[in-house]
């Protein structure tokens, strides 16, 4: 019994740095439990951009702090991430861990590539 | 730099109780599942028991179910195995590990403790 | 439960040497979830390998980890000295999480 997670290979943030993708997994077991982690992975440097656990049939709570908001529906989690930038550009991995109950398992997700362009700044306007 | 530092074995009869502690630094504790491997004298590594992130989930191994208490104090930075109804058996360098970003490997380890249970 | 069994229990080796270590699960180790430490004597494990193949930070290039399912293998190219040590995998996809016996490197 294996956990498999799956998410888009390429996601084009909006022009207001607003990026969204689906992490999907198929669970093992009948988990209570999940905790979703995203992990952004650039020049072999890996941070941790966000996580939430949450009960199934629940809704996603993120750290008031948090850059994503993100919902739940079976198993399935629609991620949302805020205030992107250019310099924000890279490969996005969803990580899955079923907590509750026992046995724990992992899926980890091949990645989402999320580009994000800086808006040209508007030209002034002479009226 | 990340430190794992263990304190708290010792000799104790079998039947009694010991209680084992890990003081983490130099990263974000709450971030990270902590776990309990053992190792038996001259003998090989076993997985004991994870608590992770917040400390409200908690996974043992079938050895030490029941007898086994594993927590975390976040603010302290600190990791305990509460070990109760001890046996012979138990005898092992008891090592503190941090699970790894991708997943429970483990890198970054204590230097260990040694618990013998002995009548 | 999934049961690591690795070979050979001990390998004898010369400095300069090639070693290849095996480290086979009794069920298929999902994503290829396994590790592997290094491990001296009076010592603390080291993590070498992550994800059957990623090497841990500071891991020298001459250690290298593939397989896949059921069969994983630990490569080292060349022997140095420092070498010599007890190697263990571990699988991290369920619990509960689970080591090899070992396999012992020691000079010939």
């Known amino acids: 019994k294996a956990m498999h997670v799956a998410q888009p290979a390429v996601v084009l943030a909006s022009s207001r740095g607003i990026a969204s993708f689906v992490c999907e997994y198929a669970s093992p077991g009948k988990a209570t439990e999940v905790r979703v982690t995203v992990l952004r992975q650039a020049d072999s440097q890996v941070t941790e951009v966000c996580a939430a656990t949450y009960m199934m049939g629940n809704e996603l709570t993120f750290l008031d702090d948090s850059i994503c908001t993100g919902t739940s529906s079976g198993n399935q989690v629609n991620l949302t991430i805020q205030g992107l930038r250019a310099m924000d550009t890279g490969l996005y991995i969803c990580k899955v861990e079923l907590m509750y109950p026992p046995p724990y398992y992992l899926g980890i997700g091949n990645g989402t590539q999320i580009y994000v362009i800086d808006p040209e700044p508007c030209p002034d306007s002479d009226f | 730099q990340v430190q794992l530092v263990e304190s708290g074995g010792g000799v104790v009869q079998p039947g009694r109780s010991l209680r084992l502690s890990c003081i983490a630094s130099g990263f974000t504790f709450s971030s990270y599942g902590m776990h309990w491997v053992r190792q038996a004298p001259g003998k090989g590594l076993e997985w004991v028991a994870v608590?992770?992130?917040?400390?409200?989930?908690?996974h043992y191994a079938d050895s030490v179910k029941g007898r086994f208490t594993i927590s975390r104090d976040n603010s302290k930075n600190t990791l305990y195995l509460q070990m109760n109804s001890l046996r012979a058996e138990d005898t092992a360098v008891y090592y503190c590990?941090?699970?790894?970003?991708?997943?429970?490997?483990?890198?970054?380890w204590g230097q260990g403790t040694l618990v013998t249970v002995s009548s | 439960e999934i049961v690591l069994t690795q070979s050979p229990g001990t390998l004898s080796l010369s400095p300069g040497e090639r070693a290849t270590l095996s480290c086979r699960a009794s069920?298929?180790?999902?994503?290829?979830?396994l590790a592997w430490y290094q491990q001296k004597p009076g010592q603390a494990p080291r993590l070498l390998i992550y994800g059957a193949s990623s090497r841990a930070t500071g891991i020298p290039d001459r250690f290298s980890g593939s397989g896949s399912g059921t069969d994983f293998t630990l490569t080292i190219s060349r022997l140095e000295p420092e070498d010599f040590a007890v190697y263990y995998c571990?699988?991290?996809?369920?619990?509960?999480?689970?080591f090899g016996p070992g396999t012992k490197v020691d000079i010939k």
């Open positions: 608590n992770w992130y917040d400390g409200s989930n908690k």
């Open positions: 069920q298929s180790v999902s994503s290829s979830y």
């Open positions: 571990q699988q991290y996809g369920r619990s509960p999480f689970t």
């Open positions: 590990a941090r699970g790894g970003v991708w997943g429970p490997y483990f890198d970054y």
